[in-house]
């Protein structure tokens, strides 16, 4: 057989036996020939360098560029392919050598003892182990070990080839930790040399260092850095680390195999780096390199090495915090220190504890923040070794975007008596206050009518050319009163009236209140009517299990037929054009009522009564009369509210406190309950009687003693109580200094 | 800034043996997996051997298998190719090449090695 | 062992203008990790090969934006937009996923 390229000038070499496949026995001499057009040389099987003993080359006794090849004596093991070659080119002529021995069917490898094969785990790939044949055609089983498994050539993927050896799927013999091949001949076995079998992966999935981030010492310390690396099954690693001081003398390196789960397609190996009393020149960039010889894989980590432990805020910590109602507050403890403070939260010089709605860590979490969270909070941070403290206050301050005190769901509103002087009120509260409150009007039929605007809960009256209050042309005389502050129920707030002079129109009103962090607005429904009128008997709104009337009075001359309606939950959507008060058009929702008519000389008066009122009877009261003459039905709505009972509180406490004799004591106690409370007060258990030195005011909310004298110290008590109980608090007046003994000295007495 | 210098290229015949060697600096050697790459005249490169960061670990593609040895010397910084039994289809250009995550992110300039009688 | 295979041995290109070089495998290089491990290089006339693209699609430190690599499990695209002068040279694939690692035939990128 030829090998290499053609050439113009040289033929290839020619060898004395014509043939690319020679078959001899053993224990014969191999003797070929080789001639050529220029200097030869030969390599064959097991030693290509020419130094084997029993091999000799000799020139050609009949010509130049001739060399003969000379084996006496032959063995199975010098099968293989003898290559005639011109020096220092590609162009040879290769004869295979099939040496037959019988009782050694499988060439050996020099000096080998055993051989390695090396497999990958993988469906895809073959291995092929290299027994290969002294005899062409044997019948060749590839034996595997442990457990002991026979692979036989299928024609397919596994096959034997006397040149090349026994091919098979690497996955098939995986398991194994040795195989090797065998030949039957005349029921004699033969078997090849041992190969054993090297499973290799190579691919690391990840390098991982623990701790992984953040890692600060203090001078003296112990540094534990360990370095995992997760790999495909059958790799190997060699473990490096890089580091500051890398020659330092205390100094641990351990490497070792971690145990994975059974069926695990993964392996984990740990190395772990130890420098026991870290000193300031350790600080720096630690590194560690995984590598299974294919694959390197690395990962690095700062280690910060400090003088001592010490703490201190971070130059971004806040001083103050703004907010608006129901949004998540989060305010970041932002500290340089080593090791990790301890972070102590407090409100007001409260401690805060973690719950639902608050976390106090690291970071201090308002989950929907109210207007009771505004405060001061200082964050208090401990160093746990030097215990040293430092503290930091974050005001917070939450805003309120404008509410509108009366707004409420939709609902068809009062009616006006025609004529009269009327004031619509909107109480805003909010924070910061508003920067301004604008009345707007629109009339009610232009916003009613309008069939191609939808009305929505949130929004009830489709309006959108709303008018400022400036421009009260073809409505009703308006003046908006200066806006007044009050205190309501503890909270600041704007009141801004609107009074109508006359009402002659049906109209819409609207208030809108801004402040930096929203808008608020109230429309009031302004239905003006010739109709009915309703009171309340008596004029003030009812309480729980107190009794209230509901007068209807009409003129008889002009109305029949009066009639008390409640006002059922209306069905949603609600139609527009039935809008602001549809109820004379839609009796399907009015609920008939029991009442009683009085006369008087000029109006019928058609009282309903509500004895022991109930929250369940809160709502809309209509009362309907109709027209003598056109028989047109005419509706007057009245929203009744009824006050919950609630038991007496007294809120603020009353303080301990110390005064000198002739000095003054003014102390107040606020209640409130529904209904309201009465207030007394009690000296040691006693009831207290004014008298020329003890003054109750405001309903004795305040108390003022005058000219204090020893006998005043004592145990004080202010208690407020209604028909559902009672509240109290009590504190003890001291009195300091002698007592001036003079006639003019007229005092009062306690009973 | 990174280098690597191989040497030891040269002629040798068939039968014959040599050793290159790879000189690496501008990083730090030992945390890095190395290979040997050669490209014979005209052909495609053709990975031949690498090895771990320790030397522990060593693979060889089956044409080299046996007749070629890698290791490394942390200490010198230099990396080596063991060649015996060489051939004449082992004559290329052998570059050496550093290894991360299984790339081979610079490479040496190369030394050429020639096997012929 | 896996081939991979570059069918265009030479592409003339224009300066300024955008091609396009193809790489295939004989087997998918999408790895049960979910990243595809091939690898481009460019080896310039008389200099040693240079990583440009690894993980199929992630350029190499230093590498200009106007190469990209992109592909399915076997079928690769390196693409280079407005070609210049230094871009010329070689361009070899190479696969990850198994071992031995082995690189295409290269295709030479020539100027018209």
């Known amino acids: 057989a030829s090998v290499g390229l053609p050439s113009v000038s040289l033929d290839l070499p020619r060898l004395s036996i014509q043939k690319d496949i020679l078959t001899i026995k053993a224990n014969t001499t191999l003797q070929i020939t080789c001639r050529g057009q220029r200097d030869l040389d030969w390599l064959w099987p097991n030693n290509q360098s020419g130094s084997e003993q029993r091999v000799e080359v000799t020139e050609c006794s009949d010509g130049l560029f001739c060399k003969t090849l000379t084996i006496p004596k032959v063995i199975g093991n010098d099968t293989g392919a003898y290559k005639c070659f011109y020096r220092e080119t590609d162009l040879a002529s290769v004869i295979y050598v099939y040496v037959q021995d019988y009782r050694s069917p499988f060439i050996a490898s020099v000096s080998d003892q055993h051989g390695v094969v090396y497999i990958t785990e993988n469906k895809n790939k073959t291995v092929v182990i290299p027994c290969l044949g002294s005899i062409s055609n044997l019948n060749v089983s590839l034996c595997a070990r442990y457990p002991e498994k026979r692979f036989v050539p299928d024609g397919n993927r596994i096959s034997w080839d006397s040149k090349k050896g026994f091919t098979i799927p690497s996955y098939m013999i995986s398991y194994a930790g040795m195989v090797f091949c065998e030949a039957k001949i005349n029921d004699e076995s033969y078997q090849s040399i041992m190969y054993i079998v090297v499973v290799v992966g190579y691919r690391i999935y990840d390098v991982v260092l623990s701790p992984s981030h953040g890692i600060e010492l203090s001078v003296g310390e112990k540094l534990v850095l360990n370095c995992t690396a997760r790999t495909e099954l059958n790799v190997g690693i060699d473990f490096n680390w890089e580091y500051p001081s890398s020659k330092h003398q205390h100094k641990k390196l351990v490497n070792r195999d971690l145990k994975t789960q059974s069926g695990s397609e993964m392996k984990k190996f740990l190395s772990t780096l130890t420098i026991d009393g870290i000193t300031r020149s350790d600080q720096g960039l630690y590194t560690c390199a995984a590598s299974s010889g294919l694959m390197t894989k690395k990962n690095s980590t700062f280690v910060r090495v400090h003088e001592k432990p010490f703490v201190a805020f971070g130059s971004g910590m806040e001083s103050l915090v703004e907010a608006t109602v129901g949004e998540r507050v989060r305010i970041p403890a932002k500290y340089l220190g080593y090791p990790p403070p301890e972070i102590k939260w407090y409100k007001n010089g409260i401690p805060l504890e973690s719950n639902h709605t608050i976390k106090a860590g690291h970071v201090l979490t308002i989950m929907e923040v109210s207007e009771r969270d505004t405060g001061n909070y200082t964050v208090i941070l401990t160093n746990p070794i030097s215990k040293e403290k430092q503290s930091h206050v974050v005001s917070l301050v939450v805003y309120v975007p404008p509410q509108i005190g009366e707004k409420s769901l939709i609902s068809p509103v009062d009616s006006y008596q025609y004529g009269t002087t009327q004031t619509l009120t909107c109480t805003v509260y909010a924070i910061p206050p508003p920067h301004h409150i604008h009345w707007y009007w629109q009339l009610e039929e232009e916003c009613a009518n309008e069939p191609s605007h939808a009305v929505s809960v949130t929004n009830p009256y489709p309006c959108e050319e709303w008018r400022s209050v400036e421009d009260f042309q073809g409505g009703n005389k308006i003046e908006v009163n200066k806006n007044q502050f009050a205190l309501i129920e503890g909270k600041n707030k704007t009141v801004s009236t609107l009074v109508i002079q006359a009402a002659n129109v049906s109209a819409l009103y609207k208030c809108e209140a801004v402040n930096k962090v929203g808008r608020g607005e109230r429309v009031i429904s302004f239905h003006v009517t010739r109709g009915p009128e309703i009171t309340l008997q008596p004029d003030m709104q009812p309480t729980e299990q107190e009794s209230v009337s509901l007068w209807c009075t009409a003129d008889r001359s002009t109305f029949e037929n009066l009639t008390w309606y409640k006002l059922g939950p209306q069905p949603l959507p609600i139609h527009v054009g039935e809008l602001p008060t549809p109820v004379c058009k839609n009796l399907d929702t009015l609920w008939k009522l029991n009442a009683t008519m009085f006369s008087n000389s000029t109006n019928d008066i058609l009282i309903m009564e509500l004895k022991n009122a109930s929250l369940q009877d809160q709502g809309d009261y209509v009362c309907l009369a109709q027209d003598r003459k056109t028989k047109k039905r005419h509706c007057v709505v009245r929203q009744l509210t009824v006050l919950e009972r609630v038991a007496p509180t007294i809120t603020g406490n009353l303080e301990n406190q110390t005064t000198s004799i002739g000095e003054s004591i003014e102390v107040s106690c606020t209640a409130s309950g529904n209904p309201p409370p009465q207030i007394m007060w009690f000296k040691d258990n006693e009831t207290l009687v004014e008298d020329s030195g003890i003054v109750l005011k405001d309903g004795n909310r305040n108390l003022t003693i005058r000219r204090v004298r020893k006998e005043d110290e004592g145990l004080y008590t202010c208690q407020a109580c209604s028909v559902l109980g009672c509240a109290k608090v009590e504190a003890f007046f001291i009195i300091e200094g002698a007592q001036e003994k003079t006639n003019l000295e007229h005092h009062h007495h306690h009973h | 800034e990174v280098q690597l210098v191989e040497s030891g290229g040269g002629l040798v015949k068939p039968g014959g043996s040599l050793r290159l060697s790879c000189a690496a600096s501008g990083f730090t050697f030992s945390m890095y997996g190395m290979s040997w790459v050669r490209q014979a005249p005209g052909k495609r490169l053709e990975w031949v051997a690498s090895?771990?960061?320790?030397?522990?670990?060593?693979y060889y593609a089956d044409s080299v298998k046996g007749r070629f040895t890698i290791s490394r010397d942390n200490a010198k910084n230099t990396l080596y190719l063991q060649m015996n039994s060489l051939r004449a289809e082992d004559t290329a250009v052998y570059y050496c090449?550093?290894?991360?995550?299984?790339?081979?992110?610079?490479w040496g300039h190369g030394t050429t090695l020639t096997v012929s009688s | 062992d896996i081939v991979i295979t570059q069918d265009e041995l030479s592409l003339p290109v224009t300066f300024g203008e955008s091609v396009s070089i193809s790489c295939r495998s004989s087997k998918s290089l999408l790895y049960k990790d979910g990243k595809t491990y091939l690898n481009w290089f460019l080896q310039r006339p008389g200099q040693s090969p240079q990583l440009l693209i690894y993980?199929?699609?992630t350029r190499a430190s230093g590498v200009s934006d106007r190469f990209s690599g992109s592909g399915s499990g076997t079928d690769f695209t390196l693409k280079i937009s407005r070609v210049e002068a230094e871009d010329v040279g070689i361009y070899y694939c190479?696969?990850?996923?198994?071992?031995?690692?082995?690189f295409g035939s290269g295709t030479k990128l020539e100027i018209k």
């Open positions: 993980l199929m699609s």
């Open positions: 090895i771990s960061i320790g030397g522990s670990y060593t």
């Open positions: 190479q696969q990850l996923v198994e071992y031995p690692f082995t």
């Open positions: 090449a550093r290894e991360m995550d299984g790339n081979y992110d610079y």
